[in-house]
C-alpha cells in the first residue's frame, strides 16, 4: 500500500509562500535610506483620511522634515512640513504633519482625500548647515478610489501595503482557503465517525517525500489556485510533528507549479527607491 501524506506540509508551504509578496514590497527593490516612508502602497476611499508614516533613522539636533508629492514631470511639490512651515504661500491645510511621541516617526495625513490626491508621495529631511544635506525617502503610492455605496465587507481588511487590485484577490482567496479548510475538517470528522478499512496504515510520509498515489489512493481534491498573493504576517507555522498511525482518510490539495506572471511583481518593483529627477526636469528637490 503506497504511503499517503496529509495536507499539512502543503498548507504549511502555502503559508510560507504567503510571506513573499509583503517581503517583496519591502526589499530588495527599496534600498536602505535614512528615511523610510510607509506603507509603500496605500488605498483609501475618497473622503477618508490617508496617512503615511515617515521615520527617521536617528534624531538629529536640527532638521526640517518635509512632505512632497511627485509631479507628473518628476518634480517634488512640497505639501507640508514638520515645524509648520509658517510662511509657505498657499498652504493646503488638508495636508498635516504630526510628530509622534517617540520623536522618530511622523504621521503625514491627507484629511478627506480626493480622487486627484492619487499619486506618488515621499518625505525629505533637510539637515541645515554646517552640514547641509537633503535626504529623500523611497516613494510611496496613494490610490484614492471612488466611494462605493455597498456596506464594508465583514472580512478583516488586508494590511495597507497591498494595492487596491490585490485586496479583492486576497479577500477572495482567503474565503476560498477558509472554505477548503472547513471541507478538510468535515472530511476528518466524517472519517472519524465512519472509519474505513485503512486501519494500521501510517499516513505520515517524510517531509521530503513527494506526493504519491498508489492504486488504493483516496480521491484527490485538486484546487487550481493559480497565483496566490497571501499577505499573512503570522509566525511561521511549525511543520507537523510525526504522528502515530490512525484511521483518518485525508484529502490532498494539489498546487500545480505555475510560474508567477511578471505583471504581478510590478506592484513592488515599480516602487523603486528615490531616484534623482531626470536632468531635463532640473534638480527637483535640490537647490541648483
Amino acid at each position: 500500500m503506497g504511503s499517503r501524506r496529509g495536507p499539512w506540509p502543503l498548507v504549511w508551504a502555502v503559508l510560507q509562500l504567503g510571506w513573499w509578496p509583503g517581503w517583496l514590497l519591502d526589499s530588495p527593490d527599496r534600498p536602505w535610506s535614512p528615511l523610510t516612508f510607509s506603507p509603500a502602497q496605500l488605498t483609501v476611499q475618497e473622503g477618508e483620511n490617508a496617512t503615511f508614516t515617515c521615520s527617521l533613522a536617528d534624531i538629529p539636533d536640527s532638521f526640517v522634515l518635509n512632505w512632497y508629492r511627485l509631479s507628473p514631470r518628476n518634480q517634488t511639490d512640497k505639501l507640508a512640513a514638520f515645524q509648520e512651515d509658517r510662511i509657505e504661500p498657499g498652504r493646503d491645510r488638508r495636508f498635516r504633519v504630526t510628530r509622534l511621541p517617540n520623536g522618530r516617526d511622523f504621521h503625514m495625513s491627507i484629511v478627506a482625500a480626493r480622487l486627484n490626491d492619487s499619486g506618488i508621495y515621499l518625505c525629505g529631511a533637510i539637515y541645515l548647515p554646517p552640514n547641509t544635506q537633503i535626504n529623500e525617502s523611497p516613494r510611496a503610492e496613494l490610490s484614492v478610489t471612488e466611494r462605493t455605496l455597498e456596506p464594508p465587507t465583514q472580512s478583516p481588511s488586508p494590511p495597507p501595503r497591498l494595492s487596491g487590485q490585490l485586496q479583492g484577490l486576497v479577500i477572495g482567496v482567503t474565503s476560498v482557503l477558509v472554505g477548503v479548510l472547513l471541507l478538510l475538517l468535515l472530511t476528518w470528522v466524517l472519517a472519524a465517525v465512519f472509519p474505513r478499512a485503512t486501519r494500521g496504515a501510517c499516513v505520515c510520509g517524510s517531509e521530503d517525500e513527494p506526493l504519491k498515489e498508489g492504486p488504493d489512493a483516496a480521491p484527490v481534491f485538486t484546487l487550481d489556485y493559480g497565483e496566490l498573493d497571501f499577505q499573512w504576517r503570522e509566525k511561521t507555522p511549525e511543520p507537523p510533528a510525526p504522528c502515530a498511525p490512525e484511521q483518518t482518510e485525508y484529502a490532498t490539495i494539489v498546487f500545480p507549479g505555475r510560474p508567477a506572471s511578471p505583471g504581478r511583481r510590478a506592484s513592488a518593483s515599480s516602487l523603486q527607491g528615490a531616484q534623482p529627477p531626470s536632468p531635463e526636469d532640473g534638480p527637483g528637490l535640490w537647490p541648483p
Epitope: 539636533d61 518635509n66 518634480q75 510662511i87 509657505e88 498652504r91
Partner: antibody, heavy 120, light 111 residues
Framework: EVQLVQSGGDLVKPGGSVRLSCVAS????????LYWVRQAPGKGLQWIGG????????NFSEKFKSRATLSVDKAKNTAYMQLNSLRAEDTAVYYC?????????????WGQGTLLTVSS | DIVLTQTPPSLSVSPGEPASISCRAS??????????LHWYRQKPGQPPQLLIF???NLESGVPDRFSGSGSGTDFTLRISRVEADDAGVYYC?????????FGQGTKVEIK
Amino acid sequence: EVQLVQSGGDLVKPGGSVRLSCVASGYTFTSYYLYWVRQAPGKGLQWIGGVNPSNGGTNFSEKFKSRATLSVDKAKNTAYMQLNSLRAEDTAVYYCTRRDSNYDGGFDYWGQGTLLTVSS
Amino acid sequence: DIVLTQTPPSLSVSPGEPASISCRASKSVSTSGFSYLHWYRQKPGQPPQLLIFLASNLESGVPDRFSGSGSGTDFTLRISRVEADDAGVYYCQHSWELPLTFGQGTKVEIK
C-alpha cells in the same frame, strides 16, 4: 546662473493699476517660492506677499491683501504682481525675490528692482 | 506683527576694525535648533544681498568676515575686519510667521 529679471515699472496715475513681471531662470522654478518686497525712496524694506509656483497659492501682508494679486505662469517661468487702486505712497522700487521651498530661509536671489511712480 | 529693532541706526567704522549690529525681535523667532532670522546688506542702487540665513549660516559666496549669532529674541551680525566694500545699509528679517518683517536698517559707513 540664477537670475530674476523684472519689468513693468512705470509712471501711473493715482487710482490706476500696474502689472509687474519677474522672469526666473537658472533654477527649477517650482522649487522656490517667489515674494515681492518694496522700498519707498530713502526708506526700509516692506514685504508685500508671496506665491508658490507649484500650485499658485499666495499669501499677503494684510496691508496689500485687498489690492494686490500674485500669479505665476509656469510655462514662462514668470511671476506677476498686479497692484490696483494706486496712490502716491505706492511710489517705490519693487523687488521680486525667492526663497527655498524646503525651509523658511532667507531671500537668496533678488531681481534688479523696478521703479513704480504714482503721480498725477 | 513681529517688530525687529536694529541698533545702532548708523555706524562709522575704520577699515580693518570690527563692527557689530544688533537686532532684537518683539517675540522669539527660534525653535528646535533653528532661529528664523536673516541678515542682508544693501548697497546704494542695488537690491539687498543675503549674508546670513537662519541666524548663523553664512550664505554661499559671502566672505567669512561676516558671522551671525543669537537665538530667541536677540541676534547679532559681526564683521571681523571691515573693508571699504562693506559700506551700505544692513537689514535683519524674520521668517517666523506672517507678515514677514524687516528691521529698519543700520547704515554702515567706512571712515
